[in-house]
């Protein structure tokens, strides 16, 4: 049986112009299905925004690399996997699609809470 | 349905040069990086390098730095792999794959290349 | 250049067994591990990706652990399409390398 038949995806298509101050950021997903026009970094910041970003962009790989570092300091270890409920709020730069795919994306957390706007937190084995 | 379909097996001798095509549908390939991966007989994966299309940087392996050029036309979403100065020990499958974050969801079918006399 | 080492590089299992492949990383890669499928004379497969993140259409049989520098592909009843051979594969930095992968054959 697929895993998580129902779980919606999100695409990105545009991306930010801005750089985002890292320490606005909590976490990100990177966005790979097919299904979407183009790969993406969805940066997920302390306030529940989500922003696409491009991920060949220098500053985007250094976000996410801090960020992955980050996560591995902070316990509990949490891995966050896109759920069924929307934000009622808009994304900051971009249209962003939920549509039913499994494991269309997965949200690296530096926090140790438990839930997220948008998404069903999963406790990393 | 991205598909990467890559050009027919070669037989090139001690010396010489390859050059491996890619052509990718389903995805615009400046949007992303393509990889070279390769595989000779019984053995595993190895990453050659990659290329990205929007702007024709490369990265590679050092081992294989100065004997493999990686191009792309965006115009026929097509990429390239040539490697120089071939010898026995490159008698192997050659993959084109994308991914942006350095992971590969998407591969070519391989292309097997024979280095002989 | 972060090496990877796989183990066991062969494996005898039945239908039904629980499969434990294990890979470790000469540093740490924060999670950046890929695990593939291979069969024979075809392209690998991408199973899973971020240590634990299954991809589209993947069985949920397959699952993903670890951190730091040692990760684990499990597959919780092998069933006969999975006899293959398995590779893990570190993106965190480039050169991205493999581990030696795992050969899961029939018992």
């Known amino acids: 049986q697929p895993d998580a038949v129902n779980a919606p995806l999100t695409c990105c298509y545009s991306f930010t112009s801005k750089m985002i101050p890292m320490s606005r950021l909590e976490s990100y997903k990177r966005i790979t299905s097919s299904r979407c026009p183009k790969e993406a970094v969805v940066f997920v910041t302390k306030l529940k925004r989500e922003v696409c970003a491009d991920p060949k962009k220098e500053w985007v790989q250094t976000y996410i690399k801090n960020l992955d570092r980050n996560q591995m300091r902070s316990e509990p270890t949490t891995l966050f996997k896109t759920a069924s409920a929307l934000r009622s709020s808009a994304p900051l730069n971009v249209k962003l699609t939920r549509k039913s795919e499994a494991n269309a994306s997965t949200t690296f957390s530096t926090t140790t809470s438990s839930t997220s706007v948008g998404v069903t937190s999963v406790t990393v084995n | 349905q991205v598909q990467l379909v890559q050009s027919g097996a070669e037989v090139k001798k001690p010396g010489s040069s390859v050059k491996v095509s890619c052509k990718a549908s389903?995805?615009?390939?400046?949007?992303?990086?393509m990889h070279w991966v390769r595989q000779a007989p019984g053995q595993g994966l190895e990453w050659m390098g990659r290329?990205?299309?929007?702007?024709?940087?490369?990265k590679f392996d050092p081992k294989f730095q100065g004997r493999v050029t990686i191009t792309a036309d965006t115009s026929t979403s097509t990429a390239y792999m040539e490697l120089s100065s071939l010898r026995s020990e490159d008698t192997a499958v050659y993959y084109c794959a994308r991914g942006v974050f350095g992971f590969f969801d998407y591969w070519g079918q391989g292309t097997t290349v024979t280095v002989s006399s | 250049d972060i090496q990877m080492t796989q183990s066991p590089s062969s494996l005898s299992a039945s239908v039904g067994d629980r499969v434990t492949i294990t890979c470790k990383a000469t540093?740490?890669?924060?999670?950046?591990l890929a695990w593939y499928q291979q069969k024979p004379g075809k392209a690998p497969k991408l199973l899973i990706s971020g240590a634990t993140s299954l991809e589209t259409g993947v069985p949920s049989r397959f699952s993903g652990s670890g951190s730091g520098k040692d990760y684990t592909l499990t597959i919780s009843s092998l069933q006969p399409e999975d006899f293959a051979t398995y590779y893990c594969q570190q993106f965190w930095s480039a050169p991205y390398t493999f581990g030696g992968g795992t050969k899961v054959e029939i018992k």
């Open positions: 290329i990205d299309p929007a702007n024709g940087n490369t």
């Open positions: 540093e740490d890669i924060y999670n950046r």
């Open positions: 389903g995805l615009t390939i400046s949007d992303t990086y």
